[in-house]
């Protein structure tokens, strides 16, 4: 047989016996000659053992590059592969020789009395017991002990090969202390040497330190570090610790095996390092290393040793946090300290408790920040041992992107009569206030949606070309007033007004407000009509349960077919910066209403009456008139707001007060409600009557008592009443000092 690949084109060495396997009897002479094309060498079984004195390799007498190997009186142990090869190459010819010795059918091991087989306890692994045979076709079984068990080749996973040995799955013999091969020849049993079975695992799955990180102590405290190694079965483990101060008096190391569940494929080992009283020199890196027969695994942790307990804020602790409404705000308490401090958060001096909107821990988290979260937050760190306290104030500023108040009134805004002067407003609330409010415009016909056009939810108007109001060519003459600042609903707002000198063309106007955190915009539909005109009788804003009439007046010579409609729910949701479809072009959303027609000399008047107006009656009312000549429809829209009935309330308290005789008392009583309540004053439950000294002003809101006298002392009541009931507040006025005697007395 030949092995290897030629490095250069040489013929294989040629053997005198042209066979792969040769079988000879013990005590005979083995002689093989090898011829080749360059220097040759022989390799034979155990060719480095003491047997080499019996082996003779000689140069052939009849030619160059020829060597003969001779072994007189061969024994079973000479069984094996004989190889003739060219020096420095892999080119070789091999013959396997069996020296049949029926008295010792197994080739004896080079080692003395016994061998060792390492096995891994694994269902998939096999082990080879190297009991080679000097006879190729023996019946060999494997004996394992104790208890005694015999394994016979099964033609599958258990087999014997004279050149290799006995192959068997590892787990079958993992219980055994020793194994040997046995052959039966003519009812006679022959045994190989004994092999000691060593079950060896080496795999370390992981090495875990506990605590794993952030270990802090102060001088004198005890350090306990646990190191756990998880391994496969049958692993022998050595632990080693590396630590800063190697010469430690109070260091203690304990290693032990941990119990694992029966049937577990894993073993656990624990090494515990204890230092009773740490010193500053014990600060540093602690490394635990676990070593097995074929693996070393390590893990490290840093131990910090402080001189004494302390607490301080870290350099990264913020003093100002800026956020935008709706964001999640995280303010971490960055500290240095040992042991970890107790952390308490306060807002404007009031302790904060965690709930679904706020989490007050190591990190103060506000889930969705709102304006009311603006303020000063104080974090107080307390060292649990020394009770030392440190505090730090963080100012939270919540920014609000511009919000335009009028945007909440989403409606196809009223139509405007041709030639009138109109004012459009944008009331902007933003923190910080907007750095600019700009107005833009565009002609309505450039932007209006034809019924044939597809309306997209996000952009129902293809309004692309917004023009600056400075450029009002082709549009209405415009003047932008200087921004005003007003306190509305307790908030500082910026009001921007746009004055249209004469409403000549229908257009769209857009105000855009920008501040550092965002922008807001409002689009106003400014529809100019020469057509009908809507008026409300008796009032612009009725209160529920009051009656109201909507009058639509149109020139009879120009218009016909006056009809009242109410605008139904929007077919599409209205998004930021969008407008509803112009109503005259989309009658599908209108509900026809019953109305009464009146005429005078020039006009037709269509009156739609709402008796006992309710909140449901709010909305947009459309009066549609048709041009007699062109048949073109003209629409006028009026938004009707019905005010909710609200029982009277009095804002602010009347304060008890003490006044000296001769001084004046001024008090006010502000009431709200719908319908507006009537205010009345009482003194000692009697109606207060105005005279020269008692003055009631501003619909009785303000009471003034001039040059008070002793008899003005008493219980004063302010009462606000409407059809929905009354509200009252009381105060006691004390008058001090002696009354001067008059001449009459």
């Amino acid at each position: 047989a030949s092995v290897g690949l030629p490095s250069v084109s040489l013929d294989l060495p040629r053997l005198s016996i042209q066979k792969d396997i040769l079988t000879i009897k013990a005590n005979t002479t083995l002689q093989i000659t090898c011829r080749g094309q360059r220097d040759l060498d022989w390799l034979w079984p155990n060719n480095q053992s003491g047997s080499e004195q019996r082996v003779e390799v000689t140069e052939c007498s009849d030619g160059l590059f020829c060597k003969t190997l001779t072994i007189p009186k061969v024994i079973g142990n000479d069984t094996g592969a004989y190889k003739c090869f060219y020096r420095e190459t892999d080119l070789a010819s091999v013959i396997y020789v069996y020296v049949q010795d029926y008295r010792s059918p197994f080739i004896a091991s080079v080692s003395d009395q016994h061998g060792v087989v390492y096995i891994t306890e694994n269902k998939n692994k096999t082990v080879v017991i190297p009991c080679l045979g000097s006879i190729s076709n023996l019946n060999v079984s494997l004996c394992a002990r104790y208890p005694e068990k015999r394994f016979v080749p099964d033609g599958n996973r258990i087999s014997w090969d004279s050149k290799k040995g006995f192959t068997i799955p590892s787990y079958m013999i993992s219980y055994a202390g020793m194994v040997f091969c046995e052959a039966k020849i003519n009812d006679e049993s022959y045994q190989s040497i004994m092999y000691i079975v060593v079950v060896v695992g080496y795999r370390i799955y992981d090495v875990v330190l506990s605590p794993s990180h952030g270990i802090e102590l102060s001088v004198g405290e005890k350090l306990v570090l646990n190191c756990t190694a998880r391994t496969e079965l049958n692993v022998g483990i050595d632990f080693n610790w590396e630590y800063p101060s190697s010469k430690h008096q109070h260091k203690k190391l304990v290693n032990r095996d941990l119990k694992t569940q029966s049937g577990s494929e894993m073993k656990k080992f624990l090494s515990t390092l204890t230092i009773d009283g740490v010193t500053r020199s014990d600060q540093g890196l602690y490394t635990c290393a676990a070593s097995s027969g074929l693996m070393t695994k390590k893990n490290s942790t840093f131990v910090r040793v402080h001189e004494k307990p302390f607490v301080a804020f870290g350099s990264g602790m913020e003093s100002l946090v800026e956020a935008t409404v709706g964001e999640r705000v995280r303010i971490p308490a960055k500290y240095l300290g040992y042991p970890p401090p107790e952390i308490k958060w306060y807002k404007n001096g009031i302790p904060l408790e965690s709930n679904h909107t706020i989490k007050a821990g190591h990190v103060l988290t506000i889930m969705e920040v709102s304006e009311r979260d603006t303020g000063n937050y104080t974090v107080i760190l307390t060292n649990p041992i020394s009770k030392e306290k440190q505090s730090h104030v963080v100012s939270l500023v919540v920014y609000v992107p511009p919000q335009i108040g009028e945007k909440s009134l989403i409606s196809p805004v009223d139509s405007y009569q041709y030639g009138t002067t109109q004012t459009l407003t944008c009331t902007v609330y933003a923190i910080p206030p907007p750095h600019h409010i700009h107005w833009y415009w565009q002609l309505e016909e450039e932007c209006a949606n034809e019924p044939s056009q597809a309306v997209s939810v996000t952009n129902p108007y293809p309004c692309e070309e917004w023009r600056s109001v400075e450029d009002f060519q082709g549009g209405n003459k415009i003047e932008v007033n200087k921004n005003q600042f007003a306190l509305i609903e307790g908030k500082n707002k910026t009001v921007s007004t746009l004055v249209i000198q004469a409403a000549n063309v229908s257009a769209l106007y857009k105000c855009e407000a920008v501040n550092k955190v965002g922008r807001g915009e409002r689009v106003i539909s400014f529809h100019v009509t020469r057509g009908p005109e809507i008026t409300l009788q008796p009032d612009m804003q009725p209160t529920e349960q009051e009656s109201v009439s909507l009058w639509c007046t149109a020139d009879r010579s120009t218009f016909e077919n006056l009809t009242w409609y109410k605008l139904g729910p929007q077919p599409l949701p209205i998004h930021v910066g969008e407008l509803p479809t112009p109503v005259c072009k989309n009658l599908d959303t209108l509900w026809k209403l019953n109305a009464t027609m009146f005429s005078n000399s020039t006009n037709d008047i269509l009156i739609m009456e709402l008796k006992n107006a309710s909140l449901q009656d709010q909305g947009d009312y459309v009066c549609l008139a048709q041009d007699r000549k062109t048949k073109k429809r003209h629409c006028v829209v009026r938004q009707l707001t019905v005010l909710e009935r609200v029982a009277p309330t009095i804002t602010g308290n009347l304060e008890n007060q003490t006044t000296s005789i001769g001084e004046s008392i001024e008090v006010s009583c502000t009431a709200s409600g719908n319908p507006p309540p009537q205010i009345m004053w009482f003194k000692d439950n009697e109606t207060l009557v105005e005279d020269s000294g008692i003055v009631l002003k501003d619909g009785n809101r303000n009471l003034t008592i001039r040059r008070v006298r002793k008899e003005d002392e008493g219980l004063y009541t302010c009462q606000a009443c409407s059809v929905l009931g009354c509200a009252k507040v009381e105060a006691f006025f004390i008058i001090e000092g002696a009354q001067e005697k008059t001449n009459l007395e």
Partner: antibody
Framework: EVQLVESGGGLVQPGGSLRLSCAAS????????MSWVRQAPGKGLEWVAT????????YYVDSVKGRFTISRDNAKNTLYLQMNSLRAEDTAVYYC??????????WGQGTLVTVSS | DIQMTQSPSSLSASVGDRVTITCRAS??????LNWLQQKPGKAIKRLIY???SLDSGVPKRFSGSRSGSDYTLTISSLQPEDFATYYC?????????FGQGTKVEIK
């Protein structure tokens, strides 16, 4: 830098004894298992013996068991291989090798042991 | 013991050639295989561990892969300093065993 320097090799007669040493530096010797691997002239590599970091466990190839002893002195950062009853087939270059997370990771230059009469 | 059959035992190649060396494991070693490089008079150096992970400082032209029980070392573009003998080492089962080695020579 990990360094392993073997010494103690030489010529010895069959049946004789020899003690190989391996001086380790550049790493925490006491944390690592160590091995000896040999290479007969012109042949491949063969694992000989292993010792765990603390010396608690030792393992040997079958052919040297009972004749060779692996040991270590962690205080001196030195690994040893005591070889007794030497045979001609023990002739080889003996390498000192560190056992890392994935078996044998760092090797020494080797020391030659020749067993011959 | 697990037998590692390494092939070829030697090969001749030129600088720039792509070279592959294979080791076949007689049993499953679950990817626990290293590749070593031996140059005359120098310490043996580990190139690859755990089938395919490169040791630090080893050029990226060396790579390792696995297909079943066959493990391959590939040198994508042979360099003059790569002429050496390469060994595979299995550590999937104790004891560790080596391949017979592959000598890479200059053509």
């Amino acid at each position: 830098e990990v360094q392993l320097v073997e010494s103690g090799g030489g010529l010895v007669q069959p049946g004789g004894s020899l003690r190989l040493s391996c001086a380790a530096s550049g790493f925490t010797f006491s944390s690592y298992g160590m091995s000896w691997v040999r290479q007969a002239p012109g042949k491949g590599l063969e694992w000989v013996a292993t010792i765990t970091s603390g010396g608690s466990y030792t393992y040997y190839v079958d052919s040297v068991k009972g004749r060779f002893t692996i040991s270590r002195d962690n205080a001196k950062n030195t690994l040893y291989l005591q070889m007794n009853s030497l045979r001609a087939e023990d002739t080889a270059v003996y390498y000192c090798v560190r056992i890392g997370e994935d078996a044998l990771d760092y090797w020494g230059q080797g020391t030659l042991v020749t067993v011959s009469s | 013991d697990i037998q590692m059959t390494q092939s070829p035992s030697s090969l001749s190649a030129s600088v720039g050639d792509r070279v592959t060396i294979t080791c076949r494991a007689s049993q499953d070693i679950a990817g626990s295989l290293n590749w070593l490089q031996q140059k005359p008079g120098k310490a043996i150096k580990r190139l690859i561990y755990a089938t395919s992970s490169l040791d630090s400082g080893v050029p990226k032209r060396f790579s390792g892969s696995r297909s079943g029980s066959d493990y391959t070392l590939t040198i994508s573009s042979l360099q003059p300093e790569d002429f050496a003998t390469y060994y595979c080492l299995q550590y999937g089962s104790f004891p560790p065993t080596f391949g017979q080695g592959t000598k890479v020579e200059i053509k």
